[in-house]
């Protein structure tokens, strides 16, 4: 019996087609992805093949103005239109709190939404009961397939699930659910979830009875053969894991941002064992037509976005200096504003010992592309912020050793004075440079704000200590020459859309007046 699994993950609000790098589509003839194009390909495959499941492994939420404005209603609407069969909860599905998940998505989705390792307690337990499930048995042709969900247990540190959801260890939570499916005579089981490729592989290895793992969170690109675009494969598609009980378990993921549609063909024997598996992600490039009816619907929903981007988010009573002349040479107040917003967006008081789990922010000055003049009645709009942060990036959470941070700050000024983008703006960090010293030895003082303290204060950076830092995904991926971050990071979790982080902060503060306050000094 053959099953075709079509899968997406980490779509992050890319409802419209995007450029090849998943930013805003500029030249339509070269654009990719988007739900209208995805629908065309899904329909083609459904037409051609008999047993097809369309699955999403989480993080539909967060990433573009679509989510900022529609807050998840757009996800439910278009996933319903594409007739998804199931979705796993990702960490970003909790970005607007549990209410922001329940109302727009859980109550509106016409497909099951899954996670076996999230347990509700207190008053939430009855409110959310039945709105998401640990597993679902789906009829496919003449057979049944069990889908069991899982979500990163780090979600409380990455999003806003509140205090009434407990995120259990994935493997511990999955095993009893899979066992239950087996007692229900379901012998074909897919684990669908959002914990990253390493955990996907562990689930394939450790959870008895799981036949296939469809994952997300780590934006992993797998491919067999010559890859069709810029993404470099982390391994073959599917990635085969030998389970502890000796089975060959295919593990798949389909990069991110709706650029690819994962396509996995599985052949099962009559006892539900995987006989063979093959496939590849399908690049949704511009040669695949956008479905006109979905496209028309997108255009209808788009109208509200255009109106939103010119509305006032808040006011500034000072000039927001985002000029290259400032932000690539010294501390600039736009850099301070953005870093403050980044930290504010990551306030998660999850432990009595820590005032917060993260206190530090770094931001490449070259990523700040425009100032905002306060003389326009102080008004700040989404449009203004899009000029400051035009690249559609995210502000991510990483874990780095102190020694890596020291290298990053040396890199920040290794060729100082040439208006290059690697000069770092900061938050929760005090740095002093001596430019008379040779490159690689210019950081004379580097103090960082403590987290394990009731009264935050600045302490010298410890080389062997592991620190959490918020930074642009661009830096996490080694951009602007920060190869040491990419090579040495110990953990990387993708965060919220950059503009969204800053706009939320400005809306919350109502009036802002960031200063230059001595975060960066030259001796």
């Amino acid at each position: 019996w053959e099953l075709t699994i079509l899968h997406t993950n980490d779509v992050h609000s890319r409802l419209e087609q995007t450029s090849e790098d998943s930013s805003k589509c500029v030249n339509a003839s070269r654009c990719m992805g988007g739900v209208a194009r995805l629908f065309t390909k899904v329909q083609q495959i459904r037409r051609a093949e008999p047993n097809v499941l369309l699955l999403d492994a989480g993080d539909q939420y967060q990433g573009t103005i679509w989510f900022t404005v529609y807050k998840g209603a757009e996800v439910a609407h278009f996933m319903n239109a594409l007739r998804y069969d199931a979705m796993a909860l990702g960490n970003h599905e909790f970005d607007n709190g549990v209410e922001g998940l329940i109302e727009p998505l859980l109550k509106e989705a016409k497909f099951p939404i899954l996670s076996a390792n999230i347990k509700a307690k207190g008053p939430l337990a009855s409110q959310i009961s039945g709105l998401y499930l640990p597993y679902k048995v789906l009829p496919v042709g003449d057979e049944v397939v069990g889908i069991v969900g899982y979500t990163s247990k780090e979600t409380p540190f990455l999003s806003n699930p509140g205090t009434n959801l407990v995120f259990e260890d994935e493997i511990t939570a999955l095993q009893p659910e899979v066992d239950k499916l087996k007692t229900l005579n379901v012998n074909k089981i897919i684990a669908l979830g959002h914990s990253g490729f390493e955990m996907d592989k562990l689930i394939a290895q450790k959870v008895r009875g799981v036949d296939v793992v469809v994952g997300g969170h780590s934006n992993t690109f797998l491919y067999t053969g010559n890859p069709p675009s810029k993404e470099v494969p982390a391994g073959k598609y599917p990635f085969i894991v030998t389970s502890d009980d000796g089975r060959k378990v295919p593990v798949v993921q389909a990069y991110a941002f709706g650029k690819y549609l994962g396509y996995l063909k599985i052949e099962f024997d009559e006892r539900g064992n995987v006989i063979s598996s093959h496939g590849n992600p399908i690049l949704l490039n511009s040669s695949i037509p956008e479905d006109p009816s979905i496209k028309a619907d997108i255009n209808k929903w788009r109208i509200k976005l255009d109106n939103y981007s010119t509305q006032e988010l808040g006011k500034t009573i000072v000039y927001l200096d985002g000029s290259s002349q400032s932000c690539r040479f010294r501390e600039c107040n736009m850099g301070n504003l953005i870093c403050d917003a980044m930290i504010n967006n990551n306030l998660r008081h999850t432990d009595e010992m820590f005032w917060n789990h993260v206190s530090m922010c770094i931001l490449n000055g070259g990523g700040i592309r425009s100032p905002i003049d306060e003389r326009n009645n102080g008004t700040i709009t989404w449009e203004n912020l899009a000029a400051v942060l035009p690249f559609g990036g995210t502000f991510d959470l990483v874990q780095l050793k102190g020694s890596t941070l020291k290298k990053a700050f040396e890199h920040s000024v290794h060729r100082y004075g040439q208006s290059t983008g690697e000069f770092l703006q900061v938050g929760g960090i005090h740095v002093v440079y001596d430019l008379s010293r040779k490159p690689g030895d210019r950081v004379v003082k580097l103090d960082v704000l403590c987290t394990k303290c009731r009264v935050p204060s600045y302490d010298p950076l410890k080389m062997d200590e592991v620190y959490k830092v918020i930074l642009p995904n661009f830096l996490a991926n080694g951009g602007d020459g920060f190869q040491m971050i990419k090579d040495e990071l110990l953990r990387h979790d993708s965060g919220d859309q950059d503009i969204n982080v800053v706009s939320t902060y400005i809306s919350k503060m109502k009036v802002i007046y960031p200063a230059v306050e001595g975060r960066i000094k030259f001796s």
């Epitope: 003839s29 495959i45 037409r47 008999p50 399908i282 040669s287 695949i288 006109p292």
Partner: antibody, heavy 121, light 107 residues
Framework: EVQLVQSGAEVKKPGESLKISCKGS????????LSWVRQMPGKGLEWMGE????????YYNEKFKGQVTISADKSISTAYLQWSSLKASDTAMYYC??????????????WGAGTTVTVSS | DIQMTQSPSSLSASVGDRVTITCKAS??????VAWYQQKPGKAPKLLLY???YRYSGVPSRFSGSGSGTDYTLTISSLQPEDFATYYC?????????FGGGTKLEIK
């Protein structure tokens, strides 16, 4: 090398049955769609219908529904077009053509050389 | 069914000429348009797919454009081997329909 090899020319009488074939080679037969296209003498191209050999799913142009049957035998990588009762108006060249539904080329990328069917009393 | 109206039905041109053939769909076919070349006694050959993508091995003098309902095939500089019949086809909805063809002859 991808090839679609069609069976030879046929001369038939009205009312007779006929089954012509198209054998695929050089590619995974079950991963592509196969269409049949008619071209009457001196005329243009008409899509008759298609089969997806992997699933056996068939789709017909309403104009040809009930007139012809499209089938495939994936064990020998061959698709068929058959008539149970031929008419003189079935006289035409019949092409099979491949369609890559998993790829991004919206069109028939490989064609057979064609089978000439002549129906005459 | 979607009608594909191709024009002109025949065309005389000389080697080196620039030639344009148009195809109008009776409804939006969202760039799912292919163009074929057919020579007498031969099977059609795919030239362009998805309105503007040249199929592998097709010379760069062949180009396509269009969206919605209007599509164009352009041959920038006619070569002797280009004299043939050209067909457009919509691959958006079944039944997949072809244009009536354009016979390109030597002037």
């Amino acid at each position: 090398e991808v090839q679609l090899v069609q069976s030879g020319a046929e001369v038939k009488k009205p009312g007779e049955s006929l089954k012509i074939s198209c054998k695929g080679s050089g590619y995974t037969f079950t991963s592509y769609g196969l269409s049949w296209v008619r071209q009457m003498p001196g005329k243009g191209l008409e899509w008759m219908g298609e089969i997806y050999p992997g699933s056996g799913n068939t789709y017909y142009n309403e104009k040809f529904k009930g007139q012809v049957t499209i089938s495939a035998d994936k064990s020998i990588s061959t698709a068929y077009l058959q008539w149970s009762s031929l008419k003189a108006s079935d006289t035409a060249m019949y092409y099979c053509a491949r369609y890559d539904y998993l790829g991004s080329s919206y069109g028939f990328d490989y064609w057979g050389a064609g089978t000439t069917v002549t129906v005459s009393s | 069914d979607i009608q594909m109206t191709q024009s002109p039905s025949s065309l005389s041109a000389s080697v080196g000429d620039r030639v344009t053939i148009t195809c109008k769909a009776s409804q939006d076919v969202s760039t799912a348009v292919a163009w074929y070349q057919q020579k007498p006694g031969k099977a059609p050959k795919l030239l362009l797919y998805s309105a503007s993508y040249r199929y592998s091995g097709v010379p760069s003098r062949f180009s396509g454009s269009g969206s919605g309902t209007d599509y164009t095939l352009t041959i920038s500089s006619l070569q002797p081997e280009d004299f043939a019949t050209y067909y457009c086809q919509q691959h958006y909805n079944t039944p997949y329909t072809f244009g009536g063809g354009t016979k390109l002859e030597i002037k």
